[in-house]
């Protein structure tokens, strides 16, 4: 008894295709060894037609493939454009030769079944509608017209011109004529189901002079499209249901034991399991829409169906599209924390993975919002300026080439809690979801800046110090000047902080930044932070206001400083207005054109290409002069 198994008998029709699944025992050797499909000859020889090593015979060229699904211990042979010559005995098997483990499969390809010679064939998908054309002679114009469905014994009425309708076709069948043409009538049947498939006869008149026409209606269930995705990656279900359902609510559901459970619909329903990682995007007025799911999990694998109905729920006789999603656990996407925890007033540094082969791609960070159909407005990007409400507390650090970029958010509040996405304008599979949780702080922050209300006087020397605990002793400390294009790390020279020391004096651990002499351009947000190599850690922020010397107090309270931050930003608006104009000039600007939101998330079209410097640590327009010094004590 062979441990390989599959269908013993496969039958199909000329011109159609088959998909033969062969199962193999769950061992590492089996998963990686050669898979083959061969045809048995009279001599007992089995001639390879296709194998997983890339071999494809001439007779299968352009019409067959073999796909291995190691996590399911199966491989699938797909053969298209079948002919009667394909009828025969085959083997699917494993091993370096065709004498390895195998399973016998018999394939029979028949001619298209003979129908009465005048039969008209209509082939439609489930949920669609069909209009059957029934010609007749002029003398039968005044006579009754009808359509009936053939059963074993009789022909059961569907509809006739006296307005009789079979109960199972009420509201679905219409008999009509077009214009003044008295030689043809039509029957339209909508919301087709499998039960509607079969042979029909349309008739005008009675007795031997009646006009009759045979109709074969084939109602096809959509073939599930196979989607093969990596764990932690993302998938887009592109659903094209046609113009007739353009105004109906749309849904995506997953087949369960007895039902298809709705995951998301355009009426606001969303499965909690997909919170923070799903969007539904109406594409156009033709009934097209897409559903994007990020952060794929093993349990997301399964049979999905999209459809349209006013209820936003699956309904028999309405158009559908189906997919079989496989989630490959051998993922190229690194396993990162999906939940990041911060405290109020503190900071988080989020490492976002991207395809290392696409280091020059534009990187983005957006906040998932669940209202409506879900959307994800971009908060920061390598060439997208930081959103105004995140001024002074959000920056993206691109580390070219290492497959990671870092997003830092500080001055956290409980409002920041939620779901965020890392994404690029490159490989869409590398979209990842992070949940940010923010708890109330119960102790002092690790990094503290003094003085806290910082006002520097024009032309003078100004020093701010950042106190850090001993646990950060061995890490690199830095100051950077924040702008809405990033946080530019200021040059520092290390004065002995790296010297080996047995003890660490908690009170004396600080890194200082000195502005000498202070200029108007020095006004703005500054961050003090720690990092280890390319791994960023905690940060804290301070706003430094710059004033001309006055006789009165030089103290400015933080609210004024923040107000001034806004002013400083507005003075820089010239740049951003240019970039907005450039955005508008881009044809098909893609997901980020619409108010910087990820709308058509499935499209990897040209992204928002705002002008200006990149938001990387080294991409600032203003170089810092030697007046900025860091002193480590």
């Amino acid at each position: 008894k062979s441990p390989i198994f599959g269908p013993q008998e496969v039958s199909s029709i000329e011109g159609d295709s088959v998909s033969i699944t062969c199962y193999y025992p769950d061992t590492s050797v089996n998963r990686h060894t050669r898979k083959y499909w061969c045809r048995q000859g009279a001599s007992g020889m089995c001639t390879t037609l296709i194998s997983s090593n890339g071999y494809l015979s001439k007779e299968y060229s352009g019409r067959a493939n073999l796909i291995n699904f190691p996590e399911n211990n199966t491989f699938v042979i797909n053969i298209e454009q079948l002919t009667q010559d394909d009828t025969g005995s085959y083997k699917c098997g494993l091993g370096t030769s065709n004498r390895g483990l195998s399973f016998d499969v018999s394939l029979e390809v028949s001619q298209v079944p003979e129908l009465p010679s005048d039969t008209h064939v209509y082939t439609k998908d489930i949920g669609r509608n069909v209009t059957i054309e029934c010609p007749f002679k002029r003398e039968n114009a005044p006579s009754k017209k009808s359509l009936c469905k053939k059963t074993n014994q009789s022909c059961e009425l569907v509809i006739d011109s006296t307005e009789k309708v079979n109960p199972s076709y009420i509201g679905r069948a219409k008999l009509f004529m077009k214009g003044t043409d008295l030689t043809v009538f039509y029957v339209n049947i909508s919301h087709l189901t499998h039960n509607d498939a079969g042979l029909y006869i349309c008739q005008a008149g009675e007795g031997p002079s009646a006009d009759k026409k045979n109709v074969d209606l084939q109602v096809l269930a959509p073939e599930p499209e196979l989607l093969y995705k990596d764990l932690r990656s993302s998938v887009t279900f592109e659903c094209d249901l046609g113009r007739e359902v353009a105004n109906e609510a749309k849904y995506l559901c997953r087949m369960n034991k007895e039902t298809c459970d709705v995951i998301i619909n355009t009426l606001g329903k969303r499965d909690p399991d997909f919170e923070g990682r799903i969007l539904i995007t109406p594409k156009d007025d033709n009934g097209r829409f897409s559903v994007l799911i990020t952060g794929l999990r093993k349990e997301d694998a399964g049979h999905y169906q999209c459809g349209a109905h006013s209820s936003g729920l699956p309904q028999e006789g309405w158009p559908i599209q189906t997919w079989q999603l496989f989630v490959n656990e051998e993922s190229t996407i690194p396993n990162r924390r999906s939940v990041v925890k911060g405290v109020t007033g503190g900071s988080v540094a989020i490492a976002c993975p991207y395809n290392p082969k696409e280091s020059s791609s534009l990187k983005y960070w957006c906040r998932w919002e669940g209202d409506g159909n879900g959307h994800c407005p971009v908060l920061v990007g390598t060439q997208a300026q930081v959103q105004e409400e995140y001024e002074g507390r959000l920056a993206l650090f691109d580390q070219p080439g290492n497959g990671t970029y870092t997003v830092i958010l500080n001055q956290l509040t409980t409002e920041d809690a939620g779901f965020y996405w890392c994404l690029t304008n490159g490989d869409s599979r590398w979209r990842t979801t992070i949940e940010l949780q923010v708890a109330e702080a119960t102790r002092e922050p690790n990094l503290e800046v003094t003085p806290q209300n910082a006002t520097a006087v024009l032309g003078e020397t100004f020093t701010v110090s950042c106190h850090y605990p001993c646990k950060f002793y061995s890490q690199e400390k830095y100051w950077c000047k924040w702008s809405n294009k990033g946080c530019h790390i200021l040059p520092s020279h290390d004065e002995g902080a790296r010297q080996s020391s047995v003890s660490c004096d908690q009170s004396s651990q600080l890194v200082s930044m000195t502005l000498n002499p202070v200029s108007k351009e020095d006004e703005g947000w500054y961050w003090c932070g720690v990092k280890q190599g390319q791994t960023y850690g905690e940060t804290t922020a301070i706003y430094i206001a710059v004033e001309e010397r006055t006789r009165g107090s030089s103290h400015v309270n933080p609210t004024d400083a923040n107000a001034r931050a806004k002013v400083a930003l507005e003075e820089e608006v010239v740049d951003s207005s240019i970039s907005e104009k450039e955005n508008k000039a881009i044809p098909n600007p893609g997901p980020f054109a619409n108010e910087r939101e990820i709308q058509n998330v499935g499209d990897q079209a040209q992204e928002n290409r705002a002008s200006g410097d990149a938001g990387s640590a080294d991409g600032q327009s203003r170089s810092s002069s030697s007046k900025h010094h860091h002193h480590h004590h």
């Epitope: 269908p7 039958s11 199909s12 998909s19 199962y23 269930a221 073939e223 298809c260």
Partner: nanobody
């Protein structure tokens, strides 16, 4: 409520034939695969045969002990399933269960892979 209803069971002599039928009117959609299992007293449920549909192609699967003797057929539009059993042996005595819609990934020979089940029909083959 999904119901699979088997019929056609009975008592026959060895080498006789019998035809089992299964109707699944309550399935929420057309099943892509339906099958037969059997369970003899004190034994595990055993895979007998299955049929799968895709487009206009049909796939038939048989358990090793019935290959060549049993033929599975059905209509996926109507969710009906038949099992023609010829050359019956006393060891074919069991309760025969109809099953529908297995997990796409699962080994269809294991009962755990199938979603819907009938109540079963008794087949007794006397020697």
């Amino acid at each position: 409520e999904v119901q699979l209803v088997e019929s056609g069971g009975g008592v026959v002599q060895a080498e006789d034939s019998l035809r089992l039928s299964c109707a699944a009117p309550g399935l929420p959609f057309s099943s892509s695969r339906m099958g037969w299992f059997r369970q003899a007293p004190g034994k595990e449920r055993e895979f007998v045969a299955a049929i799968g549909w895709s487009g206009r192609s049909t796939y038939r699967y048989y358990g090793d002990s019935v290959k060549g003797r049993f033929t599975v057929s059905g209509d996926n539009a109507k969710n009906t399933l038949d099992l023609q059993m010829k050359g019956l042996k006393p060891e074919d005595t069991a309760v025969y269960y109809c099953a529908a819609d297995p997990d796409y990934y699962g080994d269809y020979r294991t009962s755990g892979a199938w979603r819907y089940w009938g109540q079963g029909t008794q087949v007794t083959v006397s020697s």
